[in-house]
Amino acid sequence: GSERTCCPVNWVEHERSCYWFSRSGKAWADADNYCRLEDAHLVVVTSWEEQKFVQHHIGPVNTWMGLHDQNGPWKWVDGTDYETGFKNWRPEQPDDWYGHGLGGGEDCAHFTDDGRWNDDVCQRPYRWVCETELDKASQEPPLL
């Protein structure tokens, strides 16, 4: 694979990763597609420090991250272990709420206006954050 040694134009470097912050909204799957086409992934939050960095850049706006439970258990898009990893859910979240009337529950995680996480309907058109690691040979993700 190829190695990225510096961040692309319009991306922000932080702690050896590059971040791109959208200014408009898409459904979770389409945001995921966008990041993958840019050889990145929806942001994976692994520490409080990274949480604060992302939160600072997105402001008080609902924003998708790379965490979902569309196939059962909660999973990070890059394979980072969810159970042992960093979490920042709002109280009583995730709740897989069915009361929204849109069909099904809530399978995709997003930053809320205070930065804490909530699960929501994946079709909602929220902003999103892409992340790619520097100095890391690009992997071959599964065919989408």
Epitope: R23, S24, K26, A29, R36, E38
Partner: antibody, heavy 122, light 107 residues
Framework: EVQLLESGGGLVQPGGSLRLSCAAS????????MSWVRQAPGKGLEWVSA????????YYADSVKGRFTISRDNSKNTLYLQMNSLRAEDTAVYYC???????????????WGRGTLVTVSS | EIVLTQSPATLSLSPGERATLSCRAS??????LAWYQQKPGQAPRLLIY???KRATGIPARFSGSGSGTDFTLTISSLEPEDFAVYYC?????????FGGGTKVEIK
Amino acid sequence: EVQLLESGGGLVQPGGSLRLSCAASGFTFSSYAMSWVRQAPGKGLEWVSAISGSGGSTYYADSVKGRFTISRDNSKNTLYLQMNSLRAEDTAVYYCAKLGTTVSGGHYFDLWGRGTLVTVSS
Amino acid sequence: EIVLTQSPATLSLSPGERATLSCRASQSVSSYLAWYQQKPGQAPRLLIYDASKRATGIPARFSGSGSGTDFTLTISSLEPEDFAVYYCQQDSNHPLTFGGGTKVEIK
């Protein structure tokens, strides 16, 4: 000069295979996602497939999924489309196109090749 | 998938006239919409992206507007070289889709 040049089109029988190539020049090829778009004779445009800059992520229209494979060789600045199990309805001009990004998070075709004609007929 | 419907299919106008082309989406595409121009025997060319932003080198007589489901491409005063087919394209939802096109012909 910034350009894309397709090749490899031609006449093929139904069920046959063909490999299209697209040679890129004038820009940092490996930094951009690329795509194939086709246009049947006298018809509109149809997106076919896309691939990320590294080649790690690929996408296909349902009409070609399982039959077409997009790939790239960044050392040769070349994009490919392997087309198998061809059908009459695959007859079209195939365009190679560069996918530009926007600050809002859109992907648009900001550079096109001149196209190569693929005819599927017995 | 999102269906883009362009109207009219054909627009017959004279040089110097104003052209107004419509693109309607089957569901909201926010502002993720582009317009392309295609002349006979040539590849398409990007005119407008993000619904209203002109691509590099595109004359100011081309303008785009709209958001959600209804979009418009306006050519303020048609030049002889503007007679062509125009396509809209959305990148809000996978797969990328194009409209069926509007042909602007000389009256």
